[in-house]
């Protein structure tokens, strides 16, 4: 529920991790809570301890296997429960039938590097991390470049509507320091959201040659 006093939200990274956030107004910080995951067609179940991330929210990661193992598919349903300790017993607080491939959030792209830099242009590449082979090429990217004197929020978004793990930035200013970030999103999933932004990649354009514009 959007307007309630509590909210339980989870996302699947498409491989072996379900990340969950439980927020509850007025809850005590030292409340001990867990997320329990029970798949409908798998032999395993998993639990993680919710740890405080802010005044009224807790988060944890359900680690389902090794980072690149494919632990769930589009037909899986995982029943997720929030259990909180009340005295000597555990009380269920929330329950959710979780469809992993309807609630995707991939890991941030990694291994950003400058392939080639000139005075006005820079070619940058990156890799996606722990992304399911099920997507094949059905991914899109957003990128942004931080210019001097601006904030990330002011940076215009560049959209790559295909699985393209590189970009050629144009119309840059010579001898100028920039930063670059990229994020990824599968096309699949009603509640799928963008990955976190990658770590920023800093680069500098080449100075203009003397005697030229």
């Amino acid at each position: 529920a959007v307007n309630g006093t509590s909210r339980f939200t989870c996302f699947y990274n498409s491989r072996a991790n379900i990340s969950c956030v439980w927020s509850q107004d007025g809850a005590l910080q030292d409340t001990s809570c867990q997320v329990h995951a029970w798949p409908d067609r798998r032999r395993w179940n998993q639990t993680c301890e919710l740890l405080p991330v802010s005044q009224a929210s807790w988060a944890c990661n359900l680690i389902l296997g090794t980072p690149d193992s494919q632990k769930l598919t589009a037909v899986d349903i995982v029943t997720l429960r929030v259990m909180c300790r009340e005295g000597v017993r555990w009380r269920m607080m929330a329950i959710q039938d979780f469809k992993p491939f309807e609630n995707l959030r991939l890991m941030a792209p990694i291994s950003l590097q400058v392939v080639h830099v000139e005075t006005h242009r820079c070619n940058i590449s990156w890799k996606i991390s722990q992304a399911s082979h099920y997507f094949e090429r059905h991914l899109e990217f957003e990128a942004r470049t931080l210019s001097p004197g601006h904030t990330w929020e002011e940076a215009p978004l560049m959209t790559l509507k295909q699985k393209q793990e590189w970009i050629c930035l144009e119309t840059l200013t010579p001898d100028t320091q920039y930063e670059f970030q990229v994020r990824v999103k599968p096309l699949q999933g009603e509640f799928t959201t963008w990955s976190p932004w990658s770590q920023p990649l800093a680069f500098r354009t080449k100075p203009a040659a003397l005697g030229k514009d």
Epitope: A1, V2, N3, G4, T5, S6, R7, F8, T9, Q24, D40, I77, T79, M92, M93, A94, I95, Q96, D97, F98, K99, E102, N103, F191
Partner: nanobody, 126 residues
Framework: QVQLVESGGELVQGGASLRLSCAAS????????MAWFRQAPEKEREFVAL????????LYADSVKGRFTISRDNARKMVYLQMNSLKPEDTAVYYC???????????????????WGQGTQVTVSS
């Protein structure tokens, strides 16, 4: 938008059975939580039972455990509450509620739920 319409409420004698129905229409979610709440005069709305739409997991208030059964028919987009061994204290307006994904909240709190029906009156006489 999700629309919920309850039916089946009536006046019955203590010890009788009754089945309430809730018809869902509009943009229904395959992974929503569906619940029944009830509200007696001068009292707060209270949780009765819940069913998860996909897996069919169920939860009940202690006061109705063993007497009430919640079920659903996915194809018809219906949720039911079978009420047996009714008692006068079960008298209330019964509401169907839905908690739409991708969020869920504290299941027994009424302010968690996004969508509500208009209610159906159940009266149990002694």
């Amino acid at each position: 938008q999700v629309q919920l319409v309850e039916s089946g409420g009536e006046l019955v004698q203590g010890g009788a059975s009754l089945r309430l129905s809730c018809a869902a229409s509009g943009r229904t979610f395959s992974n929503a939580n569906m619940a029944w709440f009830r509200q007696a005069p001068e009292k707060e709305r209270e949780f009765v039972a819940l069913i998860t739409w996909s897996s069919g997991s169920t939860l009940y208030a202690d006061s109705v455990k063993g007497r009430f059964t919640i079920s659903r028919d996915n194809a018809r987009k219906m949720v039911y509450l079978q009420m047996n061994s009714l008692k006068p204290e079960d008298t209330a307006v019964y509401y169907c509620a839905a908690d739409g994904p991708p969020y869920s909240g504290t299941y027994y709190r009424y302010d968690t739920y996004d969508y509500w029906g208009q209610g159906t009156q159940v009266t149990v006489s002694s």
